[in-house]
Amino acid sequence: AMHVAQPAVVLASSRGIASFVCEYASPGKATEVRVTVLRQADSQVTEVCAATYMMGNELTFLDDSICTGTSSGNQVNLTIQGLRAMDTGLYICKVELMYPPPYYLGIGNGTQIYVIDPEPCPDSD
């Protein structure tokens, strides 16, 4: 599989936003790339979001996606929003070179995202 690098640990902001870079070593000159973020909790793997982009163009997730991102060369900057403490887990970056053939696939080792729910503000008298 292709080599895919991502940070081991990221701490989400108090607003529930986490960002990390997913970088892949492309064997050749792909023009169409698909990036998928997977969440692994226990032995279950679920898809968080996915986007296909043409090299040189912006990364576009679906309108209702909790992910946004930008791409630059073989690097994708991913941001996941709306995270809560229960969303803490391992987030895996999957990269597929879709076109031109051949097909290449790479899976990162995952980024452990820690999310801490903010303490509610105390009532003021």
């Epitope: 599989a1 064997p27 050749g28 793997v45 895996i92 051949p102 290449y104 696939l105 899976i107």
Partner: antibody
């Protein structure tokens, strides 16, 4: 048009050696990982070896059945990949295919190991 | 190495039938699965890549599905020219092994 043309197959005695070649055209050879796959008579497809390209430092990988006996190599200036086969056994008989990361395949070359 | 279990090993179906072939892997391969068709005397032909994507020039009768460890190749309406042996392959591993194959015949 993409073409992969294998050559070098033939009859060889057990314990002998043979070198297969695969000439590629119609695509950017240096951008691709190259593989050898075989099909023995009456058996299924068996992946044998892979050589990656320059961004991957020409890393090589082998199946357990051929490791230590077969060597894969490539010459990007000639758009060619090779399989050096040593210490051949009768069970190495089959049709050998080269493939550009399994998207493009050659027509195959027959290797027969027999005394 | 990741083990590939393909089933059935052979099947016979009628023209127009919907045909399903399955492939199970010993561990999660994250959709890194290809399907091939091999006809006697011909080179293998890539049908499906990345579990669900139809390769260029392949009939839309063929489709792939699955994730994790369980994958399926479906032929929506079997045609005489589909007689062949079909193989799955894991393309995630450094040792991209094939399934044992499914020989498909027409009744």
């Amino acid at each position: 048009e993409v073409q992969l043309v294998e050559s070098g197959g033939g009859l060889v005695q057990p314990g002998g050696s043979i070198r297969l070649s695969c000439a590629a055209s119609g695509f950017t050879f240096s951008d691709n990982w190259m593989n050898w796959v075989r099909q023995a008579p009456g058996k299924g497809l068996e992946w044998l070896a892979q050589i990656r390209n320059k961004p991957y430092n020409y890393e090589t990988y082998y199946s357990a059945s051929v490791k230590g006996r077969f060597t894969i190599s490539r010459d990007d200036s000639k758009n060619s990949v090779y399989l050096q086969m040593n210490s051949l056994k009768t069970e190495d008989t089959g049709v050998y295919y080269c493939t550009a990361q399994f998207a493009y395949w050659g027509q195959g070359t027959l290797v027969t190991v027999s005394s | 190495d990741i083990q590939m279990t393909q089933s059935p090993s052979s099947l016979s179906a009628s023209v127009g039938d919907r045909v399903t072939i399955t492939c199970r892997t010993s561990e999660n391969i994250y959709g890194g699965l290809n399907w091939y068709q091999r006809k006697p005397g011909k080179s293998p032909k890539l049908l499906i890549y990345g579990a669900t994507n139809l390769a260029s020039g392949v009939s839309s009768r063929f489709s792939g599905s699955g994730s994790g460890t369980d994958y399926t190749l479906t032929i929506s309406s079997l045609q005489p020219e589909d007689v062949a042996t079909y193989y799955c392959q894991n393309v995630l591993s450094r040792h991209p092994g094939f399934g044992s194959g499914t020989k498909l015949e027409i009744k």
